[in-house]
Interface confidence: low
Amino acid sequence: ESALITQQDLAPQQRVAPQQKRSSPSEGLCPPGHHISEDGRDCISCKYGQDYSTHWNDLLFCLRCTRCDSGEVELSPCTTTRNTVCQCEEGTFREEDSPEMCRKCRTGCPRGMVKVGDCTPWSDIECVHKES
């Protein structure tokens, strides 16, 4: 029964880690910003700017940070708990059905239509039929 509770059993915030980058898993899972070690004994911090994890997990590796493509601007950098947020440059937008690339917004509406919405990083200009 003395085996019930050891240093290994303490909640992550209760342990004095040998290095700041390690803590023990809780319920077999590691917190956001960490991945689990191969032997399941430690939670290892993701590398800032290189990889990340957003949820409690038992990943053996953190997820690789996204690099913004040319034609995109970096809205916020990759942290250990959040992926890079990229946004299409001004004058371009990302369509829901082809999210892998930014497309140029149209410069104007077809004849007989009027513009009711501007070009945004997530939508083309919006055109509606002119009322006759």
């Epitope: 019930l4 509770i5 290994q8 059993d9 209760q14 319920e27 077999g28 899972l29």
Partner: antibody, heavy 121, light 118 residues
Framework: EVQLVESGGGLVKPGGSLRLSCAAS????????MHWVRQAPGKGLEWVAG????????YYADSVKGRFTISRDNAKNSLYLQMNSLRAEDTAVYYC??????????????WGQGTLVTVSS | QPVLHQPPAMSSALGTTIRLTCTLR?????????VYWYQQRPGHPPRFLLR?????????GPQVPPRFSGSKDVARNRGYLSISELQPEDEAMYYC???????????FGSGTQLTVLS
């Protein structure tokens, strides 16, 4: 539906050996930690051994250390318990149980029906 | 003295609420541990009921109704299992397990036999 079915129990003489098996189905066996827990007649639950998802890490109760070996074959969706140098006090129903995580916790979410091991001369 | 102590038997009437206790030996602090509860009906394998660490960190077992709930009293170093609207099928042995939010060795309490009086 998660199912765990133990087999291999029976009557064995003190000092003898027995190998228990647990056939798992209804879930991705290779991603869960697994345990053996036993219950002597009329007594409470006693954790025996645990193994992580890959089989790389094995843990034992002090009462069985050096005599019992836990193992798994992920290709066959099977968990095993090799029991050597059996003693009368090892007489119990042996349950196979799934851990809710890849590793080992106290959260054993699914249990088999158990297999009875009787050690007697 | 065992690490986990449970009273051997408790009873309550049909339709009432009962609270089962699991006391952690006082050289350990329940504040940093989860409390796990298992139910075992006669002739059946154990069944995981719930895990309780805090109001915001808890989990219910598969198909376990909300009549079963967990709590902790840090001052008294105790974990509790509350069962409301007691039913005949709640008559069973209840085991707690504690500590080790990531521990690999596993110790159960000695169990409490619950009798439901009709």
């Amino acid at each position: 539906e998660v199912q765990l079915v133990e087999s291999g129990g029976g009557l064995v003489k003190p000092g003898g050996s027995l190998r228990l098996s647990c056939a798992a189905s209804g879930f991705t066996f290779s991603t869960y930690g697994m345990h053996w827990v036993r219950q002597a007649p009329g007594k409470g639950l006693e954790w025996v051994a645990g193994i992580n998802y890959s089989g790389n890490n094995k843990y034992y109760a002090d009462s069985v250390k050096g005599r019992f070996t836990i193992s798994r074959d992920n290709a066959k969706n099977s968990l095993y318990l090799q029991m050597n140098s059996l003693r009368a006090e090892d007489t119990a129903v042996y349950y196979c149980a799934r851990d809710h995580s890849t590793w080992l916790s106290r959260h054993l979410d699914y249990w088999g029906q158990g297999t009875l091991v009787t050690v007697s001369s | 003295q065992p690490v986990l102590h449970q009273p051997p038997a408790m009873s309550s009437a049909l339709g009432t609420t009962i609270r089962l206790t699991c006391t952690l030996r006082n050289d350990h602090d329940i504040g940093v541990y989860s409390v796990y509860w298992y139910q075992q009906r006669p002739g059946h394998p154990p069944r995981f009921l719930l895990r309780y660490f805090s109001q915001s960190d808890k989990s219910q077992g598969p198909q376990v109704p909300p009549r079963f709930s967990g709590s902790k009293d840090v001052a008294r170093n105790r974990g509790y299992l509350s069962i409301s609207e007691l039913q005949p099928e709640d008559e069973a042995m209840y085991y707690c397990a504690m500590g080790a939010r990531s521990s690999v060795t596993h110790v159960f309490g000695s169990g409490t036999q619950l009798t439901v009086l009709s």
